[in-house]
Interface confidence: medium
């Protein structure tokens, strides 16, 4: 019973003793099998470009690194891989920690290895909670919201033997990081005359050419196609002035399962160049393009227990397929297509990145004609299936698209079949000239449940069965709101602190659910929250008719300082669990520690006369016009629809670097609302930027990055997706 290091840990409970022979056989000192061994044993050279699942599938099994008790529970098209490390408070890697899934025992478990690392496969698209347990430490839980088909690098987890209270901090004065990320340019460039210009300046690539006598074929060489050519990421973490009291700057870069971590003493113009060797965490070559997640954290002297993190994504180029296999040389007329990544590697040295070309738009449902209100043939193939008034959208954790189509909520399965799952009944329908009764949909990433925020009935509903039922109108239950309207200065504070089903609401609109299952919804000028126990509270605003406060133009505010005028839509960013609010042509971000800042749009009081705010590339200096809906992708990209119902009907995107650009919806040269001869539908199966939309009412993003638009005026659901090679029936 010896505590050698004075760290309170005795015998084999202490990971430092695990190297001693007496502890070698202790379960606390043994981890799961090393994934590197498993992958390398089962590695095949063909095909060079494997699907994500094929790269990692060997890691799960009865005798693998991720132990599954029964049948393989994973969907090959949805899986992701969680990688992380567990350490003790002094930074010692912790072996023998059992890591399992809360609520999903069939997903199995793993045990951290000697270096404290672990690997777990899970179905993505959903939010999962991991449970960490090892004697004598306090067990912990961590929630992760997983994308599809990618690695998820979890922050290092520190296990403690006792709970120590973290003092609360006033964050209102702290400046958050605003890193600038520049990745090395994609190697699209090549020199037409290598003899004269052997170096491609943008990428520092050496280029050579040899003519083959007696033929019109040339041999070409590019140093960028060699194994030693790495991808670079330049990260600027601080600007010329450093915020007051900033003591340390933390950096994390996650790419293909690698997690790089470093911390720096605070200083001006702090920069770091991250070098990626184009392999994944298991040493497998990565072909095509990969998303790197860069996190920069600020640690302040007055609040050492808290690091303020900001995340950005950047694109890094992996290995290129070699068309000719001639020791780094290729025949200039011999090309090879990476179908999975959508890259054409030419023998000339040029690369054509199809996914970097403008996105493509298609119609996945609707044909421009309205269905009848009774919806007799609502079920079947989605394509061409008529709609009445698509007003709300949400994406399910399996990739299903839920469509709020006036009086029916309809589910488009990944198979592209559609089924009605809820009928919304109202005697008023027969008196309505405007079928766009507005309600909002949201999916809980934890349970997959679908919620309906209905302004008219002042209630929030949960759909009971997502696969449909005979009783479509009875397929919902109230989760918030009595139907009674909460009036200003209500003594009961509209039910705050009590059960949400007993609360009174004012005017529920946009709704979103975060990775922990907390539901947020707009209620008049407030944003309200329902916790996992069904208790309601107000996150932002009040019902006391307090005057709207002008938003801070360029600095963050505490949530208690903010009073909104007319918020409409909400979205949660899966990357950092922050809540985004659409309010009067401005999009606000509320971080998990309740700091509010503008992400896109320029409030009127912040605009300087004489400056054209429609031209700015920066989202926070760009004016939004009649913004109608927002959504956020798993890579943190914000999407905004704007419509004046006349000439402006578009979708714009804001990257994690804060740049805004048009993604879909060309300006119409006539008035879609008032001119009956104005053609406001066009562009399917072509570039989305050239397509014409008509009153886009709602937005949703799937985990694979496909953006769905409820094109209300055109009575269609449009899908905007990356430009990729299309395979025929023979997979060619």
């Amino acid at each position: 019973n010896k505590d050698n290091e004075g760290d309170g840990l005795v015998d084999c409970l202490d990971p430092d003793c695990c190297l001693q022979s007496a502890c070698q056989n202790s379960l606390l000192c043994r981890g799961s099998r090393d994934p590197l061994d498993i992958i390398q044993q089962g590695q095949t050279d063909w095909p060079a470009v494997k699907s994500f699942y094929d790269r990692i599938k060997l890691l799960a099994g009865k005798d693998s690194t991720h132990i599954i008790p029964g049948e393989n529970p994973f969907n090959s098209s949805l899986v992701s891989l969680i990688r992380g490390q567990v350490v003790t408070t002094d930074g010692t890697p912790l072996v023998g920690v059992n890591v399992s899934f809360v609520k999903y025992p069939k997903y199995g478990y793993t045990i951290t290895r000697q270096d404290g690392t672990f690997d777990l496969i899970a179905n993505g698209g959903a939010s999962l909670t991991l449970h960490f347990e090892r004697a004598p430490f306090m067990s912990q839980e961590r929630t992760v919201w997983l994308p599809w088909n990618s690695f998820y690098a979890m922050d290092t987890l520190v296990m403690k033997t006792e709970e120590n209270s973290i003092p609360s901090c006033d964050l209102s004065g702290f400046v958050r990081p605003d890193p600038i990320i520049i990745s090395s340019p994609l190697s699209t460039f090549f020199s037409a005359a290598p003899g004269q210009n052997p170096i491609v300046p943008e990428t520092q690539v050496l280029h050579e050419e040899i003519e083959l006598p007696g033929s019109n074929v040339k041999l070409r060489y590019l140093s960028s196609r060699t194994a030693g050519y790495k991808s670079l990421l330049k990260i600027t973490m601080t600007q010329s002035t450093v915020p007051l009291n900033l003591i340390r700057v933390h950096l994390m870069v996650a790419v293909e399962g690698h997690l790089f971590q470093k911390s720096f003493q605070a200083s001006p113009n702090l920069a770091y160049t991250f070098i990626w060797d184009k392999t994944d965490a298991y040493g497998q070559r990565v072909y095509g393009l990969s998303d790197a997640v860069v996190s920069v954290g600020f640690e302040y002297e007055t609040c050492p227990s808290l690091i303020l993190w900001e995340k950005r994504t950047a694109l890094l180029q992996g290995f290129e397929l070699d068309p000719s296999n001639l020791g780094g040389w290729s025949l200039d007329k011999h090309h090879i297509l990476n179908v999975k990544s959508g890259i054409l590697h030419k023998g000339t040295g040029e690369n054509q990145f199809l996914t970097q070309q403008p996105a493509i738009i298609t119609s996945i449902m609707g044909n421009g004609r309205r269905r009848s209100i009774s919806c007799p043939s609502c079920n079947g193939l989605a394509e061409g299936n008529k709609l009445l008034a698509p007003v709300a959208l949400a994406v399910g954790i399996d990739g299903s698209l839920y469509v709020g189509d006036f009086n029916y909520i309809r589910r488009i399965f990944p198979s592209r079949n559609v089924t009605s799952i809820l009928e919304l009944r109202n005697k008023e329908f027969k008196h309505s000239n405007n079928p766009a009764h507005k309600y909002y949909l949201a999916v809980d990433p934890v349970s997959g449940s679908l919620y309906v925020s209905d302004t008219n009935s002042r209630r929030i509903y949960r759909v009971k069965s997502l696969s449909g039922t005979k009783d479509l109108a009875g397929n919902s239950e109230v989760v918030a709101g009595t139907g009674e309207q909460c009036l200003p200065f209500d003594e009961a504070r509209c039910g705050d602190g009590g059960k949400a089903i007993d609360a009174t609401l004012m005017s529920p609109r946009g709704i979103a659910v975060d990775k922990n299952g907390l539901m947020y919804f707009v209620d008049a000028t407030m944003i309200r929250k329902v916790d996992q126990n069904g208790i309601i509270s107000t996150l932002l605003g009040s019902n006391d008719l307090t005057a709207v406060r002008p938003l801070s133009c360029d600095s963050s505010m505490d949530v208690a300082q903010v009073r909104l005028e007319w918020p409409t839509d909400l979205a949660v960013n899966p990357m950092d669990n922050s809540l985004y609010v659409l309010e009067n042509n401005v999009i606000l971000r509320i971080t998990e520690n309740h700091q509010v800042s503008i992400i896109a749009g320029r409030p009127m009081h912040c605009q300087v006369p004489g400056i054209d705010y429609s031209l700015s590339k920066l989202a926070i200096h760009s004016a939004l016009e009649s913004a109608s809906a927002i959504a956020i992708s798993h890579t943190g990209v914000l999407y905004i629809t704007e419509t004046d119902e006349k000439k402006i009907n578009r979708l714009r995107q804001v990257t994690t670097n804060g740049e805004i650009c048009l993604l879909a919806g060309a300006a119409s040269d006539c008035d879609c609302k008032n001119d009956v001869n104005c053609n406001c539908y066009s562009g399917d199966d072509a570039y989305a930027t050239d397509a014409i939309l008509n009153s886009p009412s709602s937005l949703a993003v799937a985990p694979d990055g496909t953006i769905y638009i409820a094109d209300l005026g055109n009575i269609r659901i449009r899908a905007v997706s990356k430009n990729k090679p299309v395979l025929n029936a023979f997979n060619q």
Epitope: N426, H437, D454, K470, A473, G483, E484, Q485
Partner: antibody
Framework: QVQLVQSGAEVKKPGASVKVSCKAS????????INWVRQATGQGLEWMGW????????GYAQKFQGRVTMTRNTSIRTAYMELSSLRSEDTAVYYC????????????????WGQGTTVTVSS | DIQMTQSPSSLSASVGDRVTITCRAS??????LNWYQQKPGKAPNLLIY???SLQSGVPSRFSGSGSGTVFTLTISSLQPEDFATYYC?????????FGPGTKVDFK
């Protein structure tokens, strides 16, 4: 508390009209439908129609079409049901009842009822 | 119009008895069925909505079930205050229609 208070009993001659009032309190009047239901002595309940106090929209049972008019005065939170061309078989207790109007989900039933107004039609 | 029928039209029971009343619709009404209790000289009182949901404030001894065309109201243990007339009502489509009622009296 939430309640509906109706006007007092009426005695009318055949061919006349009667107008029954229903005053709401304890809740937001414009948020909920008002339904009218009648019950002849010793008989069952008979639904006459509904009115949305917010929009003024109405829906009447075919049997009463052309004879019944449902209106409201939102400023005094009162709904009215007027039945014309009265006949002896219209003798009944007339109830107003609250239903969850303004909602997609209108099938929740009538959760608050007035005390009833007795209308007697007799020559 | 949708016709509603109830059975039995009356029944005699004792305190503590389990009582079941059946309501039938002339066509499928999904689960749009409500149950009311009415005592002599009083207005009806909503007990159950959408076939099986208990109205707040109603004792848990009352329960409802069924969908489509056949529905039941069950009182698990009859109490003295439960002697009354019970009506079913469909709200699937207008005109809303009531059943003729079932009178529960003392045995």
């Amino acid at each position: 508390q939430v309640q509906l208070v109706q006007s007092g009993a009426e005695v009318k001659k055949p061919g006349a009209s009667v107008k029954v009032s229903c005053k709401a309190s304890g809740y937001t009047f414009t948020n909920y439908d008002i339904n009218w239901v009648r019950q002849a002595t010793g008989q069952g309940l008979e639904w006459m129609g509904w009115m949305n106090p917010n929009s003024g929209n109405t829906g009447y049972a075919q049997k009463f079409q052309g004879r019944v008019t449902m209106t409201r005065n939102t400023s005094i939170r009162t709904a009215y049901m007027e039945l014309s061309s009265l006949r002896s078989e219209d003798t009944a207790v007339y109830y107003c009842a609250r239903g969850p109007g303004g909602s997609f989900y209108y099938y929740y039933g009538m959760d608050v009822w007035g005390q009833g107004t007795t209308v007697t039609v007799s020559s | 119009d949708i016709q509603m029928t109830q059975s039995p039209s009356s029944l005699s029971a004792s305190v503590g008895d389990r009582v079941t009343i059946t309501c039938r619709a002339s066509q499928s009404i999904s689960s749009y069925l409500n149950w009311y209790q009415q005592k002599p000289g009083k207005a009806p009182n909503l007990l159950i909505y959408t076939a099986s949901s208990l109205q707040s404030g109603v004792p848990s001894r009352f329960s409802g079930s069924g969908s489509g065309t056949v529905f039941t109201l069950t009182i698990s243990s009859l109490q003295p205050e439960d002697f009354a007339t019970y009506y079913c009502q469909q709200s699937s489509s207008t005109p809303f229609t009531f059943g003729p009622g079932t009178k529960v009296d003392f045995k």
